[in-house]
């Protein structure tokens, strides 16, 4: 059909930078590159119907369904979703194509379904059908990668049994310590499953899919390095594969490496050796100890020995199920308003944890750093000096852990007042929790020095706002103070704040803050 317009349907995935919800046709977002949805003519349909490829969207993801129409003249349009018409505002791009967009913000189950776009151009009418569904991430998994020896080759295969199929990459680094951080120039990444170059200093394999990224480091003992001051420890669960690499460099080839478990040499078939000459003509040997599926009796001290280097050992511990070891007692901190401070949790865990820090129902990303002693640490510094309860939550496949922290910020009280016909109340959030005084202002006491003690009711910690205590004091009105100005003052070790209230005046109460 010569009259049919050229139509392009695209999907644009957005990285959300706003928490608004709704549909809109012009919404500022960070965008990914558009994905062509094909838009083919649907056969045997009454009228001209184009069908876009089905769209699967993650829960809470934001997308734009977009149609580009290459047809002469103006176009008008209408979106229909679940029998409701939705506003449609076409515009023209630089190539003079008609552009119609539907933005779906923070995808939910209710926004899944068929989106019909009716377009009327000067030449013809046609319909475009989009089917949007929520991706079933319940079936998704991301498993930590593990290593296998490649059959008949001196190479390692990295395997991650994940859904959807993950992208596997080797992360290699040839320098020591801090310079092997992920974004360092010393780090080389290879997007492949098989690795032949096994002589590097630091070797990790990472797998990533829609659920994130998981990495496994090739546990290495380097006989040319001074041993760690704490015993290197490797945890594994029953049935997982064990891989330990022993590496040594010497001026010539005249040395050999051996592995022992406790005092017995490893059985043949549980190790393999590789060697190469380095650029300065020294010999590098590596000896792998491996067990394809560990059992409890594979626990013990694995010692790598050399005829030209001092031996080094690591403790391999096989556990039935994963664990998270840390002290879960709650911790309270009291800091000044500008004091630098971070919460921190030290833990030992296997497998590696996923964690979050939460404050005031908002979650923050959680970073963890391995320490030399086999422990890890997670710190949270982004509290912006907001007092309240902070929660650290960690979990792995087998265990969960939660720890509570309370942050108190030392500051002078701030007073808010409110009054009714029968009483006046003052509130303060200073810390340490303030004490209260009420004073009456009269002819006899123009400076408001006459203290009121009758009818005062103090409540420490009246309401708890995400762990932030608020103190209040209420004055019940008596004939003796009606029509007078009264002053409530909150004071702690950092200062005093007061608020003056006119009692029993008609209309809204005037409050005078005098600090």
């Amino acid at each position: 059909n010569q009259d049919l317009p050229v139509i392009k349907c695209v999907l644009i995935n957005h990285k959300n930078n706003d928490s608004s919800v709704g549909k809109s046709s012009s919404y500022p977002m960070v965008s990914e590159s558009p994905e062509d949805l094909g838009c083919a003519l649907r056969p045997q349909s009454s009228g001209t119907v184009y069908e876009a490829a089905a769209v699967e969207v993650d829960v809470s993801a934001s997308i734009t369904l977009q149609v580009l129409v290459d047809a002469p003249g103006n176009i008008s349009c209408l979106w229909v979703f679940k029998h409701s018409s939705l506003n449609c505002q076409p515009h023209f791009d630089l190539q003079n194509r008609g552009v119609v967009s539907m933005v779906i913000l923070k995808m939910t189950e209710t926004q899944a379904g068929e989106y019909l776009l009716f377009i009327q151009s000067e030449a013809t009418n046609y319909t475009i059908l989009f089917t949007v569904s929520i991706r079933n991430t319940l079936l998704y998994t991301l498993r930590r990668p593990y290593f296998r020896k490649m059959e008949n080759q001196d190479a390692l295969v990295c395997i991650s049994e994940s859904v959807p199929e993950p992208i596997v990459e080797w992360v290699l680094c040839d320098s020591q310590g801090e310079s092997c951080k992920e974004e360092s120039p010393a780090v080389v990444k290879k997007e492949e499953k098989v690795l032949h170059e096994l002589f590097g200093t630091d070797i990790r394999c990472c797998a990533r899919n829609e659920l994130g990224r998981e990495c496994t480091r090739l546990f290495t003992i380097d006989l040319n390095q001074t041993p760690q001051t704490t015993l290197p420890q490797l945890f594994l669960k029953v049935g997982e594969p064990l891989w330990i690499r022993c590496k040594a460099v010497h001026v010539n080839h005249g040395f050999g490496l051996t592995w022992e478990l406790e005092n017995k040499a490893l059985e043949e078939g549980n190790y393999f050796e590789m060697s190469t000459y380095s650029t300065n003509r020294t010999m590098i040997r590596i000896l792998f100890a491996f067990v394809s599926s560990v059992a409890r009796n594979d626990t013990g001290y694995y010692t790598c020995s050399s005829s030209k280097h001092p031996s080094q050992s690591a403790l391999v511990t096989i556990v039935e199920k994963g664990f998270i070891n840390a002290t879960n007692s709650s911790e309270d901190y009291e800091i000044d308003q500008y004091e630098e401070f971070c919460f921190s949790v030290r833990f030992k865990a296997y497998p590696q944890i996923r964690c979050t820090w939460t404050f005031s129902r908002k979650s923050f990303p959680c970073e963890q750093k391995g320490l030399d002693n086999g422990y890890s640490i997670s710190k949270f510094c982004n509290h912006k000096h907001q007092p309240g309860e902070y929660i650290f939550h960690a979990e792995n496949d087998d265990a969960q852990f939660t720890k509570m922290f309370t942050l108190n910020i030392r500051r002078k009280p701030q007073v808010l007042a409110e009054a009714s016909a029968s009483q006046a109340s003052c509130f303060s959030d200073g810390y340490p929790l303030p004490s209260w005084t009420w004073k009456k202002c009269s002819d006899k006491s123009p400076n408001c020095t006459e203290e009121i003690t009758e009818g005062v009711w103090n409540r420490k910690a009246n309401r708890k706002v995400f762990g932030q205590w608020v103190s209040s004091s209420t004055l019940n009105m008596s004939e003796a103070i009606k029509g007078f100005l009264v002053k409530c003052c909150a004071y702690n070790s950092l200062g005093t704040s007061c608020e003056t209230i006119l009692l029993n005046s008609p209309g809204p109460f005037p409050f005078i803050q005098d600090n």
């Epitope: 041993p227 015993l231 290197p232 050999g256 051996t258 406790e262 005092n263 001290y301 010692t303 020995s305 050399s306 005829s307 030209k308 280097h309 001092p310 031996s311 080094q312 050992s313 690591a314 403790l315």
Partner: nanobody, 111 residues
Framework: QVQLQESGGGLVQPGGSLTLSCTAS????????FAWYRQAPGKQRELVAF???????TDVESVKGRFTISGDNDKNTAYLQMNGLKPEDTAVYYC?????WGQGTQVTVSS
């Protein structure tokens, strides 16, 4: 885990001698996996001498001909015989065996 206990450190004049001992407990013992390290103030821990997998004792260049490592399997003990001591040998000396470290013994060479 193995427990290691060093002894024999002390103050000695340049040119003098000391013998350090390191006794292991809590594990079956094999002298082949023993090593001595030292750490001078403000410096990294460094290797001094070790017994290799084939039972040979090896010293690093800076102590060659002056220090000797040996051991007694029956007594679960390794030794470091130090002769011709120099002020630059001043350090805390540690023994290492199968992933475990002793708590260290101070050797001070001074006139």
């Amino acid at each position: 885990q193995v427990q290691l206990q060093e002894s024999g450190g002390g103050l000695v004049q340049p040119g003098g001698s000391l013998t350090l001992s390191c006794t292991a407990s809590g594990s079956t013992f094999s002298i082949n996996h023993f090593a001595w390290y030292r750490q001078a103030p403000g410096k990294q821990r460094e290797l001094v001498a070790f017994i290799s997998s084939d039972g040979r004792s090896t010293d690093v260049e800076s102590v060659k001909g002056r220090f000797t490592i040996s051991g007694d399997n029956d007594k679960n003990t390794a030794y470091l015989q130090m002769n011709g001591l120099k002020p630059e040998d001043t350090a805390v000396y540690y023994c290492y065996y199968r992933g475990s470290w002793g708590q260290g013994t101070q050797v001070t060479v001074s006139s």
